[in-house]
Interface confidence: low
Amino acid sequence: MMTGTIETTGNISAEKGGSIILQCHLSSTTAQVTQVNWEQQDQLLAICNADLGWHISPSFKDRVAPGPGLGLTLQSLTVNDTGEYFCIYHTYPDGTYTGRIFLEVLESSVAEHGARFQIP
């Protein structure tokens, strides 16, 4: 039975040209995390593998940095980066947990962070 929950940074916004940290945290389970995938729609951004470490997809190498922790840092943001981002935790023996973050990249200098929320 899957008992864990994913806590994410929720709905967030950032300025064009700036950086943002996407973070998820898996709690309430003793399951072993095998791998964490970071995805945007159907595109794979990065992977943190328990054995092999971090791998950034070649097409994002210039703008994506691993960490902090299991999080992901997006750099040189453009308006096209607006959208849904998913952290996918592959665990043993629970299975897969998925967290969702919505990022809005703003032209203006007004960029506020949304509240944190949990996805069961």
């Epitope: 095998t34 791998q35 995938n37 995805e39 159907d42 595109q43 794979l44 992977i47 593998n49 054995d51 092999l52 791998h55 997809s57 070649p58 592959h90 043993y92 023996p93 299975g95």
Partner: antibody, heavy 121, light 110 residues
Framework: EVQLVETGGGLIQPGRSLRLSCAAS????????MHWVRQAPGKGLEWVAV????????YYADSVKGRFTISRDNSKNTLYLQMNSLRAEDTAVYYC??????????????WGQGTTVTVSS | QSALTQPRSASGNPGQRVTISCSGS????????VNWYQQIPGTAPKLLIY???QRPSGVPDRFSGSQSGTSASLTISGLQSEDEAEYFC???????????LGGGTQLAVL
């Protein structure tokens, strides 16, 4: 529809080379690790090799190490297996299979129908 | 000689419960979840159970998996004639960096 189609099998003499291809469709090929698995006539499954989503991580079974090379072309949605110095014991049906994870083995959730390689003089 | 050990064959009557075992070592099954594959003669293998006990969509719930220490088992409850096939266990070996497969168990529905 998610599909894998293997080609390139055939009858080949011992010591010669052969390249198998696996064409993927219906999914984002560049986001998944891919495997080759073979099955000799009347025998069980034998894992051959795996390659990560971007092609930078590769692992091989001891029985093929140094002779076989797994590679991929994500722009063509195609997986390859270059087989050199072929032996009679390499005779088998060769399957390509998708791994649900991009980098590391998790299972093989989609399989092709296989291509037959016969090594004989 | 397979690194994972399975019985060569198993059998059962329709409606019965059948369990197929798979034993490994600390470098594979002690560290990683087992997957099970079903292969009907003349067809490609099919993923049956992954991550020890998860079923892909379309796999009936009469198939279940369990794992403890260095051994695992596949249980088919309510055996049906279409379950007649060969079943393979598989696990990634973290030490050797290879995928290890059991020798396969041929299941006969009597």
């Amino acid at each position: 529809e998610v599909q894998l189609v293997e080609t390139g099998g055939g009858l080949i003499q011992p010591g010669r080379s052969l390249r198998l291809s696996c064409a993927a469709s219906g999914f984002t090929f560049s986001s998944y690790a891919m495997h080759w698995v073979r099955q000799a006539p009347g025998k069980g499954l034998e894992w051959v090799a795996v390659i990560s989503y971007a092609g930078e991580v590769k692992y091989y079974a001891d029985s093929v190490k140094g002779r076989f090379t797994i590679s991929r072309d994500n722009s063509k949605n195609t997986l390859y297996l270059q087989m050199n110095s072929l032996r009679a014991e390499d005779t088998a049906v060769y399957y390509c299979a998708r791994d649900p994870l991009p980098l590391h083995y998790y299972g093989m959730d989609v399989w092709g129908q296989g291509t037959t390689v016969t090594v004989s003089s | 000689q397979s690194a994972l050990t399975q019985p060569r064959s198993a059998s059962g009557n329709p409606g019965q419960r059948v369990t197929i075992s798979c034993s490994g070592s600390s470098s594979n099954m002690g560290r990683r979840p087992v997957n099970w594959y079903q292969q009907i003669p003349g067809t490609a293998p099919k993923l049956l159970i992954y991550s020890q006990n998860q079923r892909p969509s379309g796999v009936p719930d009469r198939f279940s998996g369990s794992q403890s220490g260095t051994s695992a088992s596949l249980t088919i409850s309510g055996l049906q004639s279409e379950d007649e096939a060969e079943y393979f266990c598989a696990v990634w070996d973290d030490i050797g960096r290879v995928l290890q497969l059991g020798g396969g168990t041929q299941l006969a529905v009597l």
